[in-house]
């Protein structure tokens, strides 16, 4: 099984934009990264810009589905 | 042992066309996050294009955006940089590089020239 | 885009001396920061990441220091090797940014 942990101090830079690192703690797999985006950035390292018009779109969403 | 090898620098006119390849072996390609960094001769480090194999995603330079293309194609671990209306500025030593949490490995550079 | 700026831009030291070298970003980068060493017709090497962490196979005379906009390279005893153009780097936004580059020469 596998779970995530935040990243140390020194593997931060993975995610850039201000994006939050997470380590992918698997026992049978070499360690993996993750990143949960800031407002505004998406891609695996959060190095994407994502246009206004898009966020204004999930914003939507998201409001619809609550 | 991690390698990275760029090709297809060469001397091009003002307004040609090259594509150069970075060639990268003994680590997990789609993992990292591949970027080209040149140096015009005498002076410093700047920054040119980044691609995250793994999605796509691609971020350019001012300097270069609407002209350069970066890509990769994960199945033979290369990435590429296409270079269009090249102009004399341009004239530099082109370096790929991976970074996991910084710019870790380098290639050894190859020379693109920019001249009439 | 955040500009680093580096200092001195050259200097002149012997060996054993003690150099530190200076970056200042144009904004908080958090501890993103990284230095590479570079000798001529050669590519740049690693040498610090995340501030202050030594990158593997680095000798533990290097040594880096800062977070928010501050940051410094230390070599605590200069070496005949190690006369080269340090550079320091940000990759806490993209673009990713180079500071201007710091020359050590031989005194």
């Known amino acids: 099984t596998s779970h995530l942990v935040k990243c140390a101090e020194k593997e931060k830079t993975f995610c850039v934009n201000g994006g939050e690192c997470f380590m992918v703690k698997d026992l049978s797999n070499p360690s993996r990264y993750l990143c949960k985006c800031q407002p505004g950035f998406t891609g695996a390292r959060c190095t994407e810009n994502v246009p206004m018009k898009v966020q204004n779109q999930e914003k939507a969403e998201e409001l619809y589905q609550k | 042992e991690v390698q990275l090898v760029e090709s297809g620098g060469g001397l091009v006119q003002p307004g040609g066309s090259l594509r150069l390849s970075c060639a990268a072996s003994?680590?997990?390609?789609?993992?990292?996050?591949i970027h080209w960094v040149r140096q015009a001769p005498g002076k410093g480090l700047e920054w040119v294009a980044a691609?995250?194999?793994?999605?796509?995603?691609?971020n350019y330079a001012d300097s270069v955006k609407g002209r350069f293309t970066i890509s990769a194609d994960t199945s033979k671990n290369t990435a590429y940089l296409q270079m269009n209306s090249l102009r004399a500025e341009d004239t530099a030593v082109y370096y790929c590089?991976?970074?996991?949490?910084?710019?870790?490995?380098w290639g050894q550079g190859t020379l693109v020239t920019v001249s009439s | 885009d955040i500009q680093m700026t580096q200092s001195p831009s050259s200097l002149s030291a012997s060996v054993g001396d003690r150099v530190t070298i200076t970056c200042r970003a144009s904004?908080?980068?958090?501890?993103?920061v990284a230095w590479y060493q570079q000798k001529p017709g050669k590519a740049p090497k690693l040498l610090i990441y995340?501030?202050?962490f030594l990158y593997s196979g680095v000798p533990s005379r290097f040594s880096g220091s800062g977070s928010g906009t501050d940051f410094t390279l230390t070599i605590s005893s200069l070496q005949p090797e190690d006369f080269a153009t340090y550079y320091c780097?940000?990759?806490?936004?993209?673009?990713?940014?180079f500071g201007q580059g710091t020359k050590v020469e031989i005194k």
């Open positions: 590089a991976t970074y996991m949490f910084a710019m870790d490995y």
């Open positions: 003994g680590f997990t390609f789609s993992g990292t996050w």
């Open positions: 691609i995250t194999p793994a999605d796509g995603s691609t």
């Open positions: 904004q908080d980068v958090s501890t993103a």
């Open positions: 995340s501030a202050s």
């Open positions: 780097q940000q990759s806490y936004t993209t673009p990713p940014t």
